[in-house]
Interface confidence: low
């Protein structure tokens, strides 16, 4: 089996071979690329914290688990992992923390077994709508992806394109309906202000959805109705003020769901009554005894489960003549 790179395979700083569409493997694809460590027994290649600027062309054909973390890849072009012969067994690809700011259309094409993809901790200013689908067809060939990890991919404010970051990410998730088989989607820590209306309806196979540590204020226009397989929904550390009746009913109707709602600034006024009633009855919310009010001031740190309808009042709306600017 291949062993950690020996001095015989010294790293060349000149650009590795790239064909126009498919990078050709060496005729013997079972070697270990320079600056990587390989275990054929574990079917694993690790090219970690090596400041690689490109994906190695000479990845061994046996690779199932590929770690390309902590590098300086900048751009993933179309066919970045396309090889001859193809990397037919590659199932798990981790590209986290590799300074990617652009992922182009078809970047993950020719990976027929790719089930897990982690792009976390990359400042993705430009994520092509066709990064995961590979083509701009209205219906693409199904992607084999089952897990897509996109935590903390939001770029710094000054590097964002003149468009909605949420919209850019969702466009990539929905293009060509390629991700119909996706079971786990992690979108934590992305400063999301909202979740576009149709996104979840088009990901019907989801089992696990992580939206924690975003800036979601409301789920009013988000429908969970189609997510009949959903097992976990992480909404911790957002800006949620209240969950309304429609959302509560949809969540309650999901047979396997566990919802995580910690550390949201719940507003404990009259609009919270339905949610409090639901919390007292439901078993779907994990750690529901930890949920506390943030507003109004008089209610701060009160436990939601301990509230009753008398506690949840709204200040009367002043008649127009008494309103001040």
């Amino acid at each position: 089996s291949s062993s950690p790179t020996s001095s015989a395979s010294s790293f060349s700083s000149s650009a590795p071979f790239l064909a126009s569409a498919v990078s050709a493997q060496p005729p013997l694809p079972d070697q270990c690329p320079a600056l990587c460590e390989c275990s054929e027994a574990a079917r694993t290649v690790k090219c970690v914290n090596r400041n690689l600027t490109e994906v190695p062309t000479d990845l061994p054909a046996y690779v199932r688990n590929l770690f390309l973390t902590g590098n300086q890849l900048a751009v993933l072009p179309a066919g970045a992992f396309a090889r001859r012969p193809p990397l037919a067994e590659l199932a798990a690809l981790n590209l986290s923390g590799s300074r990617l700011d652009e992922v182009r259309a078809g970047a993950f094409e020719h990976l027929p077994s790719l089930r897990q993809l982690d792009l976390s901790h990359n400042p993705l200013a430009d994520l092509s709508p066709f990064a995961f689908s590979g083509s701009n067809a209205s219906v693409s060939a199904p992607s084999p992806l089952v897990e897509l990890i996109l935590n903390h991919i939001v770029p710094p404010e000054d590097e964002r394109q003149n468009r909605s970051f949420e919209g850019m990410v969702v466009a990539a998730l929905l293009a060509g309906r390629a991700l119909q088989g996706l079971r786990r989607l992690e979108l934590a820590s992305n400063h999301f202000l909202y979740l576009p209306r149709d996104v979840l309806a088009q990901l019907p196979s989801l089992r696990h959805l992580d939206l924690s540590n975003n800036s979601l204020v409301s789920l009013t226009y988000v429908s969970f109705r189609n997510l009949t397989h959903l097992e976990s929904l992480h909404l911790e550390d957002n800006a949620l003020k209240v969950l309304h009746n429609g959302t509560l009913a949809e969540l309650q109707g999901l047979p396997h769901i566990r919802v995580f709602l910690d550390n949201n600034p719940w507003v404990c006024d009259c609009h919270m009554a339905d949610m409090v009633t639901w919390l007292k009855e439901t078993e779907v919310v994990q750690g529901k005894d930890r949920l506390t009010c943030a507003y109004p001031e008089k209610m701060r740190n009160r436990v939601l489960l301990e509230l009753n309808s008398a506690d949840l009042d709204c200040d009367p709306i002043l008649p127009p003549s008494l309103q001040t600017s």
């Epitope: 395979s9 079972d30 012969p85």
Partner: antibody, heavy 121, light 107 residues
Framework: EVQLVESGGGLVQPGGSLRLSCAAS????????IHWVRQAPGKGLEWVAY????????EYADSVKGRFTISADTSKNTAYLQMNSLRAEDTAVYYC??????????????WGQGTLVTVSS | DIQMTQSPSSLSASVGDRVTITCRAS??????VAWYQQKPGKAPKLLIY???SLYSGVPSRFSGSRSGTDFTLTISSLQPEDFATYYC?????????FGQGTKVEIK
């Protein structure tokens, strides 16, 4: 003793076909890739094609793509090169050689003696 | 395709001479370069693989080295049986390509 023995060469008219065989012995056939390399009279070496140890993947030089087919029968420890639509410029000694898949960039470490293919009318 | 430009195309040397043959790849081929010796009417024989690794059974007077995309085959002290044609070959990317060959003749 490792041996590769080519056979099947001969004189053929332009547009004709030939099938070359490469019989391997003395090593575990399924652990190696097999390449075909040719050498026109008085010229240098030209790579033609290769097949992986499982037989699941093949690759060809542009000059023969669509005309030549490489295959292998692991039960017989034999690789084949089916050559169709032969041209005068295909005239050469054809060698099969093995590539050690367990060594990084190993090179073609054993070669057959070669078989001459002559395409002429 | 990756071109392997080999030089010189021929050279004359005497027994005992130090001989150097070079090959330049048109783009990065990592260390995926091999060197072969071929005598008239015979199949090529592998001398060096992975740019600098001496193949089993090859005399130690043969050596290979790499500097970026430049590869060198050195025969430290030429012997009578070394008069032959030498080829470099890259196996980094398909199509596999060979250098044009260097014929080493007796001076």
């Amino acid at each position: 003793e490792v041996q590769l023995v080519e056979s099947g060469g001969g004189l053929v008219q332009p547009g004709g076909s030939l099938r070359l065989s490469c019989a391997a012995s003395g090593f575990t056939f399924s652990s190696y890739y097999i390449h075909w390399v040719r050498q026109a009279p008085g010229k240098g070496l030209e790579w033609v094609a290769y097949i992986t140890s499982t037989g699941s993947y093949t690759e060809y030089a542009d000059s023969v793509k669509g005309r030549f087919t490489i295959s292998a029968d692991t039960s017989k420890n034999t690789a084949y090169l089916q050559m169709n639509s032969l041209r005068a410029e295909d005239t050469a000694v054809y060698y099969c050689a093995r590539y050690d898949r367990s060594t990084r960039y190993s090179g073609l470490d054993y070669w057959g003696q070669g078989t001459l293919v002559t395409v002429s009318s | 395709d990756i071109q392997m430009t080999q030089s010189p195309s021929s050279l004359s040397a005497s027994v005992g001479d130090r001989v150097t043959i070079t090959c330049r790849a048109s783009q990065s081929v990592s260390s995926a370069v091999a060197w072969y010796q071929q005598k008239p009417g015979k199949a090529p024989k592998l001398l060096i693989y992975s740019a600098s690794s001496l193949y089993s059974g090859v005399p130690s007077r043969f050596s290979g080295s790499r500097s970026g995309t430049d590869f060198t085959l050195t025969i430290s002290s030429l012997q009578p049986e070394d008069f032959a044609t030498y080829y470099c070959q890259q196996a980094y990317a398909t199509p596999v390509t060979f250098g044009q060959g260097t014929k080493v003749e007796i001076k």
